[in-house]
């Protein structure tokens, strides 16, 4: 009788991650007797992944009944296949020995290779802040993909970015892959509506690739411009005079009256009004009693926009001129070392 | 045919020694382990020990390590089995048997037995 | 050493009859059970292995079922020539352990 030979017919069996893979092999014999055993990898460090005989195997189960006493087929199935199950799977036969069985012939071995879908992928922006033409990073992260081949893209509002980097990881053989990925972004005032997309095809997907996203919103920081006009009132000696705070974003905005330097009164963003572009508009005035003033005086609409250094904007009224006489426009003056004119 | 056939019944004194033979035709006489069983008059099975036909390994049962050799001679597809130090409980009919399990052990074929009687 | 326990000893039954026999091993042995029947001046027949598997050419009326340490022997209609001593033997590990027996008699 011919030496029994195992056979493993596949070279290579290809799986997605979370199906079943079928691993065959067959004896060309049932001699001599003895268990067969499959093991991934080779060599003294090679893993049990199934014991005819013995052991628990909770993930394996056999193609044919082993216990049959003509059973040649030794094919067995894993289930729940994930990235770390990849590599080489040999069926080997052993004899009976004693005390233990000794191994008499492997199989060539059958290559596990898992395909496993990349993890969303996730964006994110800079830590602080950053206004309008300053450039931005945003980094992209996917994770758990096979095989290592993949596609990364950027977009902002649909508009393809040329400006980014992208690694794999690792560089060598491994059971999973990552991708990292910067993008540079420069940012204008139109960007509150704005989105930065990354988009990652692998062969898993089939054609439909994953997307992540941030919105800029999260990102930018448009300071506000400043008018100060005057309206005269009714009252002989009132005048009206408005802060106009435009184009800001975020909301977040305290703005603080001076007459000649001193404090008259500070109040906080509420009721806005909101611009296409995404961007706020909000007005403020002060009614200033003319009569209370014996000499000119500088009002001062100052404005600290989100947590960011006062900027300001001064307005000079001359007592002595009827309040309807006076001009609406004035040029900014500096109230401080720390601010800054806005014109 | 397939079968197991085992040499003749065998009178001993005590302290003597006994080789019984048993010899396999019709199947891959390498291909399969020996095992050998004995029966004392009115009693149970009682194993003896293993033997590998491939390879010649052996497995015995404790009680009689020291006093029993099994061998196998592939040439000729005969399995031995000596015995020795006789006693007087001994006495007991002698079976082969051909080991039929894949990954475990149990005996499809067996020989007709062979009947030692230990006596003085 | 793995022990194996056979119960009843003996049993006395009719032909026609139901007849179970169990074998209870000292320690867990998978399917690695083997039933033997063995009539007077014979040598013992394979008749189930790997605990359930009927040995080719063994009647259909005898069937083996259990697994780690409890295993039972079942003839579903005794015929005449069914009446014998019934062994089970471990085969899981060595050294190889056979229990007690049980005689199958006529009532």
């Known amino acids: 009788e011919e030496e029994l030979q195992v056979i493993q017919p596949d070279k290579s069996v290809l799986v997605a991650a979370g199906e079943t893979a079928t691993l065959r092999c067959t004896a060309t014999s049932l001699i001599p007797v003895g268990p067969i055993q499959w093991f991934r990898g080779a060599g003294p460090g090679r893993e049990l992944i199934y014991n005819q005989k013995e052991g628990h195997f909770p993930r394996v189960t056999t193609v044919s009944e082993s216990t049959k006493r003509k059973n040649m087929d030794f094919s067995i199935r894993i289930g729940n296949i994930t990235p770390a199950d990849a590599g080489t799977y040999y069926c080997v036969k052993f004899r009976k020995g004693s005390p233990d069985d000794v191994e008499f012939k492997s199989g060539a071995g059958t290559e596990l290779s898992v395909r496993a879908k990349p993890s969303a992928p996730v964006v994110s922006g800079p830590a602080a802040r950053a206004t309008p033409q300053h450039t931005v990073s945003f980094t992209c992260e996917s994770h758990g993909f096979s095989p290592r081949d993949i596609t990364l893209k950027w977009f902002k509002n649909g508009n393809e970015l040329s400006d980014f980097q992208t690694n794999v990881d690792p560089v060598g053989e491994s059971v999973s892959y990552s991708i990292h990925s910067t993008a540079k972004v420069v940012l204008t005032r139109e960007d509150v509506h704005s989105q930065v997309i990354c988009e990652v095809a692998h062969v898993t997907l089939q054609g439909d690739p994953l997307r992540g996203t941030a919105n800029l919103s999260e990102t930018i920081r448009v300071p506000p411009t400043l008018e100060v006009t005057q309206q005269p009132v009714r009252a002989e000696n009132q005048v009206n005079v408005t802060c106009q705070v435009r184009k800001f974003y975020p909301q977040r905005l305290q703005l603080t009256w001076l007459e000649n330097g001193n404090v008259s009164r500070t109040e906080t963003a509420s009721t806005v009004t909101e611009n296409k572009d995404g961007t706020y508009n909000w007005m403020s005035w002060l009614l200033v009693n003319v009569s209370a003033h014996r000499d000119d005086v500088k009002l001062t609409c100052q404005v600290e926009h989100d947590g960011q250094p006062a900027v300001s904007k001064s307005h000079d009224l001359k007592v002595s001129a009827h309040p309807k006489e006076q001009g609406s426009n004035t040029a900014a003056e500096n109230t401080g070392s720390n601010e800054r004119n806005i014109y | 045919q397939v079968q197991l056939v085992q040499s003749g019944a065998e009178v001993k004194k005590p302290g003597a020694s006994v080789k019984v033979s048993c010899k396999a035709s019709?199947?891959?006489?390498?291909?399969?382990?020996i095992v050998w069983v004995r029966q004392a008059p009115g009693q149970g099975l009682e194993w003896m020990g293993w033997?590998?036909?491939?390879?010649?390994?052996?497995n015995y049962a404790q009680k009689l390590q020291g006093r029993v050799t099994m061998t196998t001679d592939t040439s000729t597809s005969t399995a031995y089995m000596e015995l020795r130090s006789l006693r007087s409980d001994d006495t007991a009919v002698y079976y082969c048997?051909?080991?039929?399990?894949?990954?475990?052990?149990?005996?499809?074929?067996w020989g007709r037995g062979t009947l030692v009687t230990v006596s003085s | 050493d793995i022990q194996m326990t056979q119960s009843p000893s003996s049993v006395s039954a009719s032909v026609g009859d139901r007849v179970t026999i169990t074998c209870r091993a000292s320690?867990?042995?998978?399917?690695?059970l083997a039933w033997y029947q063995q009539k007077p001046g014979k040598a013992p027949k394979l008749l189930i292995y790997?605990?359930?598997n009927l040995q080719s050419g063994v009647p259909s009326r005898f069937s083996g079922s259990g697994s780690g340490t409890d295993f039972t022997l079942t003839i579903s209609s005794l015929q005449p020539e069914d009446f014998a001593t019934y062994y089970c033997?471990?085969?899981?590990?060595?050294?190889?352990?056979f229990g007690g027996g049980t005689k199958v008699e006529i009532k």
């Open positions: 048997a051909r080991e039929a399990g894949s990954s475990w052990y149990d005996f499809d074929l």
């Open positions: 033997i590998s036909a491939y390879a010649g390994e052996t």
């Open positions: 320690q867990g042995i998978s399917s690695w």
């Open positions: 033997q471990q085969g899981a590990s060595f050294p190889i352990t």
């Open positions: 019709g199947y891959t006489f390498t291909g399969y382990g």
């Open positions: 790997a605990a359930s």
